[in-house]
Amino acid sequence: LMGGQDKPFLSARPSTVVPRGGHVALQCHYRRGFNNFMLYKEDRSHVPIFHGRIFQESFIMGPVTPAHAGTYRCRGSRPHSLTGWSAPSNPLVIMVTGNHRKPSLLAHPGPLLKSGETVILQCWSDVMFEHFFLHREGISEDPSRLVGQIHDGVSKANFSIGPLMPVLAGTYRCYGSVPHSPYQLSAPSDPLDIVITGLYEKPSLSAQPGPTVQAGENVTLSCSSWSSYDIYHLSREGEAHERRLRAVPKVNRTFQADFPLGPATHGGTYRCFGSFRALPCVWSNSSDPLLVSVTGNPSSSWPSPTEPSSKSGICRHLH
């Protein structure tokens, strides 16, 4: 990862993708340490702040403007050389977001996938973006970039992710850029959580008072396992939203979560999954499906006292 013998390594924390008004720390790593360094911007725009200035260990840039977007290099201090400075570092591209309307991001076949499968993340917009960028939250590497394809007044790009492994699970966002301003990106798409299942043993799912209930009777679904899952996720076939609850250790040494569904109005097929706090987007195998049937007066909906989570937020910790 580090540069060659006389070449420093320039990196950005937390990410090279920075929202307008945000801050980013640029680090110039040279000869096994962070020493004094100078910064350069390749297109020479917006650099009065760098002229003749020497930075120590890191440079905090911000609040950033579109003019900060571009390619940066650093030179490390080398007192005994002719120039006093190293060769230029690797180029580091800083992308500034929030400059155009956000695109949309969709997952095909869906955001809940088995380990080893491939998912297509499609980023699209009615803004004629030349390039689309896909970025996973918490990753400092550059985002993936694709040329936008334009059809019927819509520009789009299909990012293929896979075969899926735990390291690829997480929250994705995409951005677009217009011609002539390749590093001035749009606002981020709404976040999309990619969840990988099938990594751990399946929990068991049961219904109280039972899987067949009278209309209006209160139903609770219990998800439990001997594995010390931190969180359980309950999904209902045909519903986009999952519900989640913290697992509670029980006296019989199992870990359980009880999902109150409220008064029964109509049935459905339910599954639950377990996950650990450290990897909130990596889930267990699915429990066996549980068919809940309602006898009596069927209705078109089942009220939910536990608020379903939004389409994103699965990969955030439950506090």
Epitope: R13, H23, A25, H46, I49, R53, E57, S58, I60, G62
Partner: antibody
């Protein structure tokens, strides 16, 4: 939302020390720095210096070198300004403000009044 | 150190007036100028940086312009809530320095 919350007012005797805290929330503390600004009675704003919250490296304005010291506790997202050997002319409101190497101070604490009087 | 000379030090305007505050730097500061608003009993608030970039949530009646050594903050239609002291600041080289402030009052 981004917030900087400073410690309360202090009344000190000449020669004593004071430590002002500034607790940050709503952003990743180590991706920005903390600037410190003094506003003396009847005077304008004067920059004391700043500390890079990523590297921990402080930088002081010439007039504030010696008795003024910055520190950080990144585990609690807090920056500190310590003033030692207090003098009557240190009586002022001290502000912390988020900012980096570019010197723009985009969010400010509410200010801490330090009064030095015998 | 770069000296920022701000004028006027005080101005009185009617609601709806266009208000202009100027700041002159003792040397070229390459558009690295910020403007702050400080209302009574409150900390300063960033309005503008890099001469003309409005900070998040700042109404578009506030605008900035300038280059070299001369910079201007304009309030296109002053409102009662704009009563405050306004400061310019150069962020070109350390020590960062502020202007002496302009107190804006509503008639």
């Amino acid at each position: 939302q981004i917030q900087l919350v400073q410690s309360g007012s202090e009344l000190k005797k000449p020669g004593a020390s004071v430590k002002v805290s500034c607790k940050a929330s709503g952003y990743t503390f180590t991706t920005a720095g903390m600037q410190w600004v003094q506003k003396s009675p009847g005077q304008g704003l004067e920059w004391i210096g700043w500390i890079n919250s990523h590297s921990g490296v402080p930088k002081y304005a010439e007039d504030f070198k010696g008795r003024f010291a910055f520190s950080l506790d990144t585990s609690v997202s807090t920056a500190y300004l310590q003033i030692s050997s207090l003098k009557a002319e240190d009586t002022a409101v001290y502000f912390c403000a988020r900012g980096g190497d570019e010197g723009v101070m985009d969010y400010w604490g509410q200010g801490t009044t330090v009064t030095v009087s015998s | 150190d770069i000296v920022m000379t701000q004028s006027p030090s005080f101005l009185s305007a009617s609601v709806g007036d266009r208000v202009t505050i100027t700041c002159k730097a003792s040397q070229d500061v390459s558009t690295a100028v910020a403007w702050y608003q400080q209302k009574p009993g409150q900390p300063p608030k960033l309005l503008i940086y890099w001469t003309s970039t409005r900070h998040t949530g700042v109404p578009d009646r506030f605008s900035g312009s300038g280059s070299g050594t001369d910079y201007t903050l304009t309030i296109s239609s002053v409102q009662a809530e704009d009563v405050a002291v306004y400061y310019c600041q150069q962020h070109y080289s350390t020590p960062w320095t502020f202007g002496g402030g302009t107190k804006v009052e509503i008639k």
